[in-house]
Interface confidence: medium
């Protein structure tokens, strides 16, 4: 039994780090392998992670960690019974993948404006709480070409857009993801999407003006 692709890990900079690797053949990860991890300088126990299968030869392990400090460094030992297959280290602050935002809601009660709000996935005392920026993806369920990304570079987890920028009378979906420039993180996973019906109606004069404008072209 050998490691084909060495473990690579990402941290949510809060309480979970996820490590993935590939073996050289089909493996029952949870029964055959153990990933031991220990904070450098730690005088307590090494913690054991029981991996799960991630495809035939792939394994994934979710390492429970304490709040991350930027200088934290973990030793990682991958064992198959009494055989040490791989030894490495992992510094969570250098491999951050933020948690996905949650509670994405589309507020349509203001006739000409859509307000999208979501929740910051971190508590206020976490360093990333004040360092996340977001990307909001809005797309039409009817038209695959109607696909747009809005970058939210301010701290407030919300986005206002004019309802008129979207087609009226059709359904849209939205989702949001996050990243933090300070730790050069990867993007988070997308949040679950939310759906709404865009029922915006342009005022008559504006509607007329648009047609007139179009006619002149």
């Amino acid at each position: 039994m050998k490691v084909l692709q060495e473990p690579t890990c990402v941290s949510d900079y809060m309480s979970i780090s996820t490590c993935e690797w590939k073996m050289n053949g089909p493996t029952n990860c949870s029964t055959e392998l153990r990933l031991l991890y220990q904070l450098v300088f730690l005088l307590s126990e090494a913690h054991t992670c029981i991996p799960e299968n991630n495809g035939g030869a792939g394994c994934v392990c979710h390492l429970l960690m304490d709040d991350v400090v930027s200088a934290d460094n973990y030793t990682l030992d991958l064992w198959a019974g009494q055989q040490l297959l791989w030894k490495g280290s992992f510094k969570p602050s250098e491999h951050v993948k933020p948690r996905a935002p949650g509670n994405l809601t589309v507020h349509t009660n203001v006739s000409d404006t859509l307000l999208l709000t979501w929740s910051n996935p971190y508590p206020p005392d976490n360093y990333l709480y004040n360092h996340l920026t977001y990307a909001v993806n809005i797309w039409s369920e009817n038209d695959p070409a109607d696909f747009r990304i809005y970058n939210v570079t301010y701290l407030e987890p919300s986005l206002r857009i004019a309802a008129s920028t979207l087609k009226s009378g059709i359904s849209y979906r939205a989702r949001v993801r996050a990243w933090a420039q300070c730790y050069n993180t990867t993007w988070s996973e997308w949040s679950p999407s939310t759906k709404w019906h865009n029922s915006y109606r342009e005022p008559f004069e504006q509607h007329h003006h648009h047609h007139h404008h179009h006619h002149h072209h």
Epitope: L39, L43, S44, E45
Partner: antibody, heavy 119, light 108 residues
Framework: EVQLVESGGGLVQPGGSLRLSCAAS????????MSWVRQAPGKGLVWVST????????SYPDSVKGRFTISRDNAKNTLYLQMNSLRAEDTAVYYC????????????WGQGTLVTVSS | DIQMTQSPSSLSASVGDRVTITCRTS??????LAWYQQKPGKAPKFLIY???TLAEGVPSRFSGSGSGTDFTLTISSLQPEDFATYYC??????????FGQGTKVEIK
């Protein structure tokens, strides 16, 4: 419930020896690092010694190095501090403490045992 | 060795007051700092670790902040049971541990 109970303190003459014990219960003793910390009357906390979970690694400040020895018996769930060549300045309450699961901070402490070095 | 300087060494305050204690280290310890509370004749109690994370069961009126070399323990509204001595302790780069000299919080 985590409990740490120190014993073995008392009055000893300068140059004498004493062995402190700390009986641990309520947690898996063999997986935790342990430490001794002392506090002279009316003074602050001073770290005295540390041992890792399997007893393979120990450390001491210069003030006690060569005179004090920390050890543990994981089968008996007991931590020890052997103190030799005692001096008047070693007079203090001695606490045993457990290291926190994730960090090298001390999350549980015993009630302490008083060591008095005096002629 | 890393030196720890706590200030003030003592302070007088009333119930309901906001109390702030500072701890300064001689070199960068990131967030590897803990705070303890000790009452007369009792063992120290673990309050805060990682400079800001409350230990289990510690009331939310306690908070910690800071990183690098400057750290603060704040009690937002002092309660009668909070009159005690408070110690900071670093745990960066063992095998040495150092405590601050303590701050005694007394009744005004």
């Amino acid at each position: 419930e985590v409990q740490l109970v120190e014993s073995g303190g008392g009055l000893v003459q300068p140059g004498g020896s004493l062995r402190l014990s700390c009986a641990a219960s309520g947690f898996t003793f063999s997986t935790y690092g342990m430490s001794w910390v002392r506090q002279a009357p009316g003074k602050g906390l001073v770290w005295v010694s540390t041992i890792n979970s399997n007893g393979g690694s120990t450390s001491y400040p210069d003030s006690v190095k060569g005179r004090f020895t920390i050890s543990r018996d994981n089968a008996k769930n007991t931590l020890y501090l052997q103190m030799n060549s005692l001096r008047a300045e070693d007079t203090a309450v001695y606490y045993c403490a457990r290291f926190f699961r994730f960090r090298n901070a001390m999350d549980y402490w015993g009630q302490g045992t008083l060591v008095t070095v005096s002629s | 060795d890393i030196q720890m300087t706590q200030s003030p060494s003592s302070l007088s305050a009333s119930v309901g007051d906001r109390v702030t204690i500072t701890c300064r280290t001689s070199e960068n310890i990131y967030s590897y700092l803990a705070w303890y509370q000790q009452k007369p004749g009792k063992a120290p109690k673990f309050l805060i670790y990682n400079a800001k994370t409350l230990a289990e069961g510690v009331p939310s009126r306690f908070s910690g902040s800071g990183s690098g070399t400057d750290f603060t323990l704040t009690i937002s509204s002092l309660q009668p049971e909070d009159f005690a001595t408070y110690y900071c302790q670093h745990y960066y780069g063992p095998p040495t541990w150092t405590f601050g000299q303590g701050t005694k919080v007394e009744i005004k």
